[in-house]
């Protein structure tokens, strides 16, 4: 039925679009870049990315249409909605602060929450992170007692333990929590590179031609026999 198919008879795909036969009398057009519509008859108005602030663009009859995210308005969603123009967002005398796409309430002492609608209790919930313990020091103040290895007003910072490190045998320091770890060269192991790697155990055939492997600090040696010599008794 190919010769009588609309793809060949009416050549419906415009502007260089490619026609695909779906059944005896149905088709689908794959449009060239810059065109859209069932028959590629419209210029793709979304090609120039006219929609701002994360909005979604659709093309209808050579025109674009932007679907705005909450907090934005305008034909291209270019205008920030000033939520603070509408009274009552922030309770208990909170100050409304307009932000791009949203707003924030700056609460008076004693109140908290998105709308300043909750009573502020310094340690409920605890602002202390990383296992820090919260202690209320006043009606609206607190202090965090941090676990070893952390610092900051809410224990948010892991103290860098590397400046005072003692990685041994060429180990390089990697910070941990209230300690440090060491990245060791191949001949050494252990958290601080103090343990010698036994190459004789790791490489049973380290010594050739009947040579005996002797582990040493930071390496190994071969004791050769029967006239053999060299690092691995291969000469």
């Amino acid at each position: 039925y190919s010769t009588s198919h609309p793809c060949f008879v009416s050549r419906p795909c415009l502007n260089g679009g490619t026609c695909h036969m779906l059944s005896r009398d149905t088709y689908e057009c794959t449009c060239q870049v810059g065109f859209t519509g069932k028959e590629c008859q419209w210029t793709d108005a979304c090609l120039s990315h006219p929609c701002a602030n994360g909005s979604t663009c659709t093309t209808v009859a050579n025109q674009f249409s932007c679907k705005c995210l909450t907090g934005f308005t305008g034909q291209k969603c270019e205008t920030d909605v000033n939520e603070c123009d509408i009274p009552g967002h922030c309770q208990h005398g909170g100050t409304c602060l307009n932000l791009p796409g949203s707003y924030q309430c700056q609460c008076p002492q004693g109140f908290t929450g998105q709308y300043c609608d909750s009573l502020y209790v310094p340690c409920a919930p605890s602002p202390c992170v990383n296992g820090g313990t919260c202690r209320q020091t006043g009606d609206f103040t607190f202090e965090c007692n941090c676990l070893p290895g952390f610092e900051g007003s809410t224990c948010e910072r892991n103290i860098d333990d590397c400046p005072n490190h003692r990685c041994q045998n060429g180990g390089v320091c990697v910070d941990g929590v209230n300690t440090y770890n060491c990245r060791c060269p191949p001949q050494w192991t252990g958290q601080f590179c103090t343990e010698d790697v036994d190459e004789c155990l790791l490489q049973p055939n380290a010594c050739q031609n009947g040579g005996t492997c002797a582990n040493r600090n930071g390496g190994y040696g071969c004791v050769c026999v029967n006239g053999w010599s060299g690092d691995d008794c291969s000469e």
């Epitope: 490190h165 041994q168 060429g170 390089v172 440090y180 958290q191 601080f192 103090t194 600090n217």
Partner: antibody, heavy 120, light 107 residues
Framework: EVQLVESGGGLVQPGGSLKLSCAVS????????MEWVRQASGKGLEWVAA??????????VYSASVKDRFTISRDDSKSTLYLQMNSLKTEDTAVYYC???????????WGQGTLVTVSS | DIQMTQSPSSVSASVGDRVTITCQTS??????LAWYQQKPGKSPKLLIY???RLQDGVPSRFSGSGSGTDYTLTISSLQPEDFATYYC?????????FGGGTKVEIK
Amino acid sequence: EVQLVESGGGLVQPGGSLKLSCAVSGFTFSDFYMEWVRQASGKGLEWVAAQRNKANDFSIVYSASVKDRFTISRDDSKSTLYLQMNSLKTEDTAVYYCSRDGGKWGLDAWGQGTLVTVSS
Amino acid sequence: DIQMTQSPSSVSASVGDRVTITCQTSEDIYSGLAWYQQKPGKSPKLLIYGASRLQDGVPSRFSGSGSGTDYTLTISSLQPEDFATYYCQQGFKYPLTFGGGTKVEIK
């Protein structure tokens, strides 16, 4: 045989300067942490300064009591460790030892020590 | 800084006695502890490193033990040449810190 030999000690007035040297032999100098430790007469041992090895970019650490006054350095070509001591105080009077960190949590080689006396 | 509390500060003992010296650190030092012997007018000599490892050439009557914050040096049978001052030292992090020393004297 591992050997460390200090020199450069002597009598100096408060506020003066002195440079100690520690000539080493018998090991690959750049592979080891090197330390300066001092001991006032009849007192215990006090760590002064350290320079880490090549793998750790020869980074340097000082005790709080000498920071900004003393400078540790090394010359690999001469296998020598130095301690430049400026703004000396009477409490810096001590025998100064240079020592090698053996790589397993211990200072395994020490020099004979050199006496620094700070007095007017 | 890591504080080192060494005890006793002195001990009187006889040849053949068993002597124990302890060292406590203000935080976990992960077995990063060394023991030294020092005789008058001489440099310190490393006896034990890594809390329990005997340095080459040191007699086996010397032994070290411990982990975390508590460490011990034991001389199993005191010999005449062992009368000296002994120091512990943490090597886990800078600044390196030493114990105050223990003088082992003849009773």
